[in-house]
């Protein structure tokens, strides 16, 4: 296993809908064809896995049908997106990169992404 | 148990065409981004084509695009490679590929005349 490097932004501010996105983007060594790509949460010293995707370059990103996530890929930049956050989804969104082949393997982590949810304030009643 | 299984390689002349087939069994095919590479004597493996999960998306190496076209049928189980104009450099084990999990056991394609 080799080490790369990972780069993503440090803060991010989900809209108004609990829409968040940002750019993971890693530091190939060498012509990797298929990447995988993970979002991990860290929240109160636990990391839970959010999303996961595999691709092949040139591809869309193949995530699973029922995931939160979505994204596409330009060269070695993902840029991901994560719907249906919540305030309570806040916390350290970190990016992992696979290149799982060809071989050698190679594993980046980026240093996460800060990701701040405000519910919206429900509309108050009108009276016409 | 997973298995792709390749099928349709054989000996053409050069210009003519095959059409390989990968039959998936054991997995939940339709949830895979799938892909035909391929490894000539004494070379490294290399990518020919990738399809995503819909077939919507497909991409190809360099040396065989305009030639070759990948496409898949989710109903069936089923990854296809159609290969035209073949050139005796296309000559190499062609495999089948569940991206980045599985591979078939390859089929021999020989373009000679």
């Known amino acids: 296993c080799k080490a790369m490097h990972v780069a993503q932004p440090a803060v991010v501010l989900a809209s108004s809908r609990g829409i968040a996105s940002f750019v993971c983007e890693y530091a190939s060594p060498g012509k990797a064809t298929e990447v995988r790509v993970t979002v991990l949460r860290q929240a109160d010293s636990q990391v839970t896995e959010v999303c996961a995707a595999t691709y092949m370059m040139g591809n869309e990103l193949t995530f699973l049908d029922d995931s939160i996530c979505t994204g596409t890929s330009s060269g070695n930049q993902v840029n991901l997106t994560i719907q249906g956050l919540r305030a309570m989804d806040t916390g350290l969104y970190i990016c992992k990169v696979e290149l799982m082949y060809p071989p050698p393997y190679y594993l980046g982590i980026g240093n996460g992404t800060q990701i701040y949810v405000i519910d919206p304030e429900p509309c108050p009643d009108s009276d016409f | 148990e997973v298995q792709l299984l390749e099928s349709g390689g054989g000996l053409v002349q050069p210009g003519g065409s095959l059409r390989l087939s990968c039959a998936a069994s054991g997995f939940t095919f339709s949830s895979y981004t799938m892909a035909w590479y391929r490894q000539a004597p004494g070379k490294e493996r290399e990518v020919v084509a990738g399809?995503?999960?819909?077939?919507?998306?497909?991409n190809y190496g360099d040396s065989v695009k305009g030639r070759f076209t990948i496409s898949r049928d989710n109903s069936k189980n089923t990854l296809y490679l159609q290969m035209n104009s073949l050139r005796a450099e296309d000559t190499a084990v062609y495999y089948c590929?569940?991206?980045?999990?599985?591979w078939g056991q390859g089929t021999l394609v020989t373009v000679s005349s």
């Open positions: 590929r569940a991206v980045s999990d599985y």
């Open positions: 399809i995503s999960r819909s077939g919507g998306t497909t």
